[in-house]
Amino acid sequence: EPHSLRYNLTVLSWDGSVQSGFLAEVHLDGQPFLRYDRQKCRAKPQGQWAEDVLGNKTWDRETRDLTGNGKDLRMTLAHIKDQKEGLHSLQEIRVCEIHEDNSTRSSQHFYYDGELFLSQNVETEEWTVPQSSRAQTLAMNVRNFLKEDAMKTKTHYHAMHADCLQELRRYLESSVVLRRRVPPMVNVTRSEASEGNITVTCRASSFYPRNITLTWRQDGVSLSHDTQQWGDVLPDGNGTYQTWVATRICQGEEQRFTCYMEHSGNHSTHPVPSGKVLVLQSHW
């Protein structure tokens, strides 16, 4: 998977008046990494992992960047003409990626009241707008403002892209990100499904990086995809990930089934418990 840095900024307006603060979150490799503390007006690391990435360096650069981005987004919201009374939001999501072959990707997306209305692929300088008339109007509005604003030229977007990549590379220099390996906790549970059948579920949690193989085996052979149900690999809020796989088996055949897990070059197999619940920690 590529390494990525994702900025998520939101500004609000009330009855047509743009509010002074802004919300900002930054994700590194899909994990919550930074957020903007509105009380202290500072960028704050999200958890110990994020703190470790920069070590004892300050977060001044991140604070400055987020503050600048928030200011830009507030100005953009002020130029959206169709603001009705009540609360409205403008959200900008900016992502840059570095792939295994060292190629890069960069994109930018704008949402109004949670609805996507404008996207840009920075490399190709291609803007895309959803079909809806509301999105078309909003996009035209914002594009016109961005064109008017001398700052928002092609060079500006490429500079933003370059800054994003520069930051990403800086974070990746930290061995905490590149060499971080957290083995999963694996637990297997069983539940009655229907007469003569049980559902067995294998859960892997608290692992990093995101890539994992989790599959049910019968007699040591992987079950076919259509007999297994997989959960998404999702962040668990602690800078790590979680996922699951389930299948239905005949009662009395439990000993034939094992959950196979492979992560970061290590692997383990986990039997189906004979009782109701069994939690097994992987020890490598």
């Epitope: 007699d219 052979v221 197999t269």
Partner: antibody, heavy 118, light 108 residues
Framework: QVQLKQSGPELVKPGASVKVSCKAS????????IYWVKQSHGKSLEWIGY????????VQNQKFKGKATLTVDKSSSTAYMHLNSLTSEDSAVYYC???????????WGQGTLVTVSS | DIVLTQSPTTMAASPGEKITITCSAS???????LHWYQQKPGFSPKLLIY???NLASGVPARFSGSGSGTSYSLTIGTMEAEDVATYYC?????????FGSGTKLEIK
Amino acid sequence: QVQLKQSGPELVKPGASVKVSCKASGYAFTKYNIYWVKQSHGKSLEWIGYIDPYNGGTVQNQKFKGKATLTVDKSSSTAYMHLNSLTSEDSAVYYCATTDGYSLFTYWGQGTLVTVSS
Amino acid sequence: DIVLTQSPTTMAASPGEKITITCSASSSISSNYLHWYQQKPGFSPKLLIYRTSNLASGVPARFSGSGSGTSYSLTIGTMEAEDVATYYCQQGSSIPFTFGSGTKLEIK
């Protein structure tokens, strides 16, 4: 490439026991099960049982329970089958096999001939 | 135990001939659990076809497999001298795993 190297032929007396070994190489030993199969002279194949080298869990053919004991030594990537109380009925070629995770007996050892004779 | 009955028990074929070996199960099995092996004289068995119709690595395309339920078959499109061997079907659907009694294929 995946290789399973079995121990050499054994000539044993009735009532004695024998331990057949199967050394795996070319893959991570604890990743895949080791299966054991018996082939009596000029006959078909009979499945004895299998062992999961990661945790030592076994599943056996009821017919061979009490006859065959399956174990592994992870440090040497070797699987063992101990056969006890041997009779002439146990004279056969014994094979170990492993899987690639998609089919049961994907790779086979060269076989170990066990002859039970007084 | 699931009994697998193979036929014929032995057969002789000329080079270039099409061969079909059948395997009949005493009870229905899913096609995911039926495999075929080839054993040449003096050698270990070798996986030929897995999950009814998938060719194992390095197996020539003249071999094919098909079937479902209780009836399965192995076909050699054009017999070659090197195909002289005993062929076994095997089920992994229920414990104990069982093998067919084998079909010995000779050359005319």
